[in-house]
Structures are given as C-alpha cells and as structure tokens.
Interface confidence: low
C-alpha cells in the first residue's frame, strides 16, 4: 500500500496556475503575483517576463501563461518571442552600426527594417525599365525593347551593383 502511494505523485493533481507547495504539505497553492505555471503538477511557478524599457506588453501575464512583449514605436522585434528590439529606419534607409543610412544609388528599401537591396535588373529578363527606381522603390520593368512600337523609348537601367564600401553593416 505504501509503495503504491509513493508512486502516485500528489502534485500531479495541481492544475496550471498553481504549484505544489512542499512547505504546506504538498497542497496546491495559487501562483504568487507576477508568476505563472502553464502546466499542471508544477512544484514552482515561473516569474513573469517583464516588458520594460524598449519592450512593451503585448499580452499580460496571467497565472497560467507568460507575458508576451513587443517593441515600443520606432522599434521592431527580432528573435524568437521578440527577444530583441531593433531601431526602425525610414523607407529608403538601412540600419548600420553608425545608425540609419540612406540606401546607396542602385539600391532600395521599401520597409522600416532590413537592408537596402539592389534594384531589379530588367535586362536580365529581356525587359526594359518602365519606371525608374528610387531609394524607397524598386524599378518597374516593362515589356522587352523588341515588344515596343517603333519610336517608343525606354529608360536605360542603371547598374544595380552597390557602390564600393557601402555594404550593409
């Protein structure tokens, strides 16, 4: 009988949101404030994640689930579970070690994050440039020069390569 009892863990009856309190004869106690247990049978509650500084609370901590953070305006999440916040830049810029820098000629970034990417080289697909690229927008490719009616002109595509010394950091 005693052997059977020892195999049955009394803590297994404690639901999520509680912990098995060894100091109180293994009764199920509610998780203290600012802590949680997401599964039953826990012997401790985990401390809630604190969304401080550049982080802000996206989902409150409850007794059964951890808080979830996102980033304050002007920053965006990086990493699993928003483990880091990275500064936003403007469209047409990229973040370097020295801060936000404009995209080099021939590259663009249409988002507030990420790096500047080369404009599409329309000629590789046998097409012509219909709309010039900018720091914020890629070029728009049009029909191939052979498809154009006589007298129509196309914009000469610029070289898509980055300028030397302007690789993303």
């Amino acid at each position: 009988f005693e052997r059977t009892r020892s195999l049955q863990d009394p803590c297994s009856n404690c639901p999520a949101g509680t912990f098995c309190d060894n100091n109180r004869n293994q009764i199920c106690s509610p998780c203290p404030p600012n802590s949680f247990s997401s599964a039953g049978g826990q012997r401790t509650c985990d401390i809630c994640r604190q969304c401080k500084g550049v982080f802000r609370t996206r989902k409150e901590c409850s007794s059964t689930s951890n808080a979830e953070c996102d980033c304050t305006p002007g920053f965006h999440c990086l990493g699993a579970g928003c483990s880091m916040c990275e500064q936003d830049c403007k469209q047409g810029q990229e973040l370097t070690k020295k801060g936000c820098k404009d995209c080099c000629f021939g590259t663009f970034n249409d988002q507030k994050r990420g790096i500047c990417r080369p404009w599409t080289n329309c000629s590789l697909d046998g097409k012509s440039v219909l709309v010039n690229g900018t720091k914020e927008r890629d070029v728009v490719c049009g029909p191939s020069p052979a498809d154009l009616s006589p007298g129509a002109s196309s914009v000469t595509p610029p070289a898509p390569a980055r300028e030397p010394g302007h690789s993303p950091q």
Epitope: G17, T18, P30, P32, P33, N34, C48, Q50, C51, K52, T57, E60, C61, S62, S63, A67
Partner: nanobody
C-alpha cells in the same frame, strides 16, 4: 482609456455594513489583479484588500480580516468590497486600484498599482 469608478460609500453607524463597488472600463478587467486602499484624513494611503486576476487568491490588511470581503465579477467588470462590523477607525476615502502586470514592490504598497479611481467616502459615526 482606463477608468475606475467607485460607488456605495456613505454614512453608517458602528457595527453597520456597506458594500462598495468599483466599475472598470477601457481595458481587459479580467486580466488584472485589483485592490482596495483607503485614506483617512491626514494619513497616508493604506492597503485594505487585494484579489488576484482570476479570484484565486486574496490578501487582507490585519485590521479588516474577518470583517471585509473582496470579490469581483469579471463578466460585469466590477470589483466589490463588502464591509461589515464597521468601526470609527474605518472612516476614510476608499479607492480601488488596478495592479500592474509587473512590480518589484509588495502587493500591499501603492506603487504596485497603476490606475486608481476617484474614491468614495465611508463615514462611520454614532
């Protein structure tokens, strides 16, 4: 916008009872712990009672244990404080407060709470 509005205060004789209510709006009431504090004339704000977000745990000041009961109705976004066996020393303005999601302070300190109501006056006199 977060709002807390207390009601139910008034004048009562010693030994009498009152039930205070705190109506919450503008946020997910059921996700937060709530508390009652009070402030007597010329004194600091004093912890009265606290209730966890899900009603799972309560805390009371020693001076009100056995006389006051804190409860909540998450469906109605309302916090309650049932006060009985009232004494003259219970005279104060009573405030409800929302517990911060995270705090390094003890749950009985005002710093643990981020939003407060305007208060309702409870007067106990013969």
């Amino acid at each position: 916008e977060v709002q807390l509005l207390e009601s139910g205060g008034g004048e009562v004789q010693p030994g009498g009872s009152l039930r205070l209510s705190c109506a919450a709006s503008g946020w997910a009431f059921g996700n937060y712990g709530m508390a009652w504090f009070r402030q007597a004339p010329g004194k600091g704000r004093e912890f009265v009672a606290r209730l966890a977000w899900n009603g799972g745990s309560t805390d009371y000041a020693e001076s009100v244990k056995g006389r006051f009961t804190i409860s909540r109705d998450n469906a109605k976004n309302t916090l309650y404080l049932q006060m009985s066996s009232l004494r003259a020393e219970d005279t104060a303005v009573y405030y409800c407060a929302r517990q911060r999601s995270y705090s390094r302070y003890d749950i009985r300190t005002p710093q643990t709470y981020d939003y407060w109501g305007q208060g309702t006056l409870v007067t106990v006199k013969p």
